[in-house]
């Protein structure tokens, strides 16, 4: 039975040209996390694998940085970065947990972050 829950940064906004930290946190399970995938719609941004470490997709290597922790940092944001982002936790024996973040990239300085999210 899957007992875990994923907390995320939720709905967030940022300014064009700026950067944003995407963060998820899996709790309430003792399952072993074997891999975390970060995806934008159907595109793979990055993977953190327990045995192999981090891999950033080549098409994003200039704009994506690993961390903080198992999170992901997106830089040089464009309005095309607006959309859904998913953190996908592959665990054993529970299976897959998925968290969703919606990012809106704004042209002007009206960007406002959603609820503040702190890793314990």
């Amino acid at each position: 039975m899957m007992t875990g829950t994923i907390e995320t940064t939720g709905n967030i906004s940022a300014e064009k040209g700026g950067s944003i930290i995407l963060q998820c946190h899996l709790s309430s399970t003792t399952a072993q996390v074997t891999q975390v995938n970060w995806e934008q719609q159907d595109q793979l941004l990055a993977i953190c694998n327990a045995d192999l470490g981090w891999h950033i997709s080549p098409s994003f290597k200039d704009r994506v940085a690993p961390g903080p922790g198992l999170g992901l940092t997106l830089q040089s944001l464009t309005v095309n970065d607006t959309g859904e982002y998913f953190c996908i936790y592959h665990t054993y024996p529970d299976g897959t947990y998925t968290g969703r973040i919606f990012l809106e990239v704004l042209e002007s300085s009206v960007a406002e972050h959603g609820a503040r999210f702190q890793i314990p």
Epitope: V33, C48, G53, I56, G69, L70
Partner: nanobody, 120 residues
Framework: EVQLVESGGGLVQPGGSLRLSCAAS????????MGWFRQAPGKEREFVST????????YYADSVKGRFTISADNSKNTAYLQMNSLKPEDTAVYYC?????????????WGQGTLVTVSS
Amino acid sequence: EVQLVESGGGLVQPGGSLRLSCAASGTFQRINAMGWFRQAPGKEREFVSTINWSGSNTYYADSVKGRFTISADNSKNTAYLQMNSLKPEDTAVYYCASSYSSSSGLGDIWGQGTLVTVSS
């Protein structure tokens, strides 16, 4: 349990330098990435720099490129952030964060933070 210990913060004049260090200790098999993030009073936590342990790829925020250099000593499980040409706007609490692998899978951890004040 994995722990991060940060050191090297302090008061420095504009144009000066500081070197931060972040050391991981505890029970883990490998560090996957380690990096620095900062938070100024009343502002969101922001990305500064990270280093990918596998491949030693380094990543920097645009605001610190050319001034800050991140490096790692794998044998000591320690990352360093050399900060040169410091500006008053670099004043913040600097947090270290890391992703790691252990016998229980992937995990991540934050340090307690070290204060950097740039002022004349």
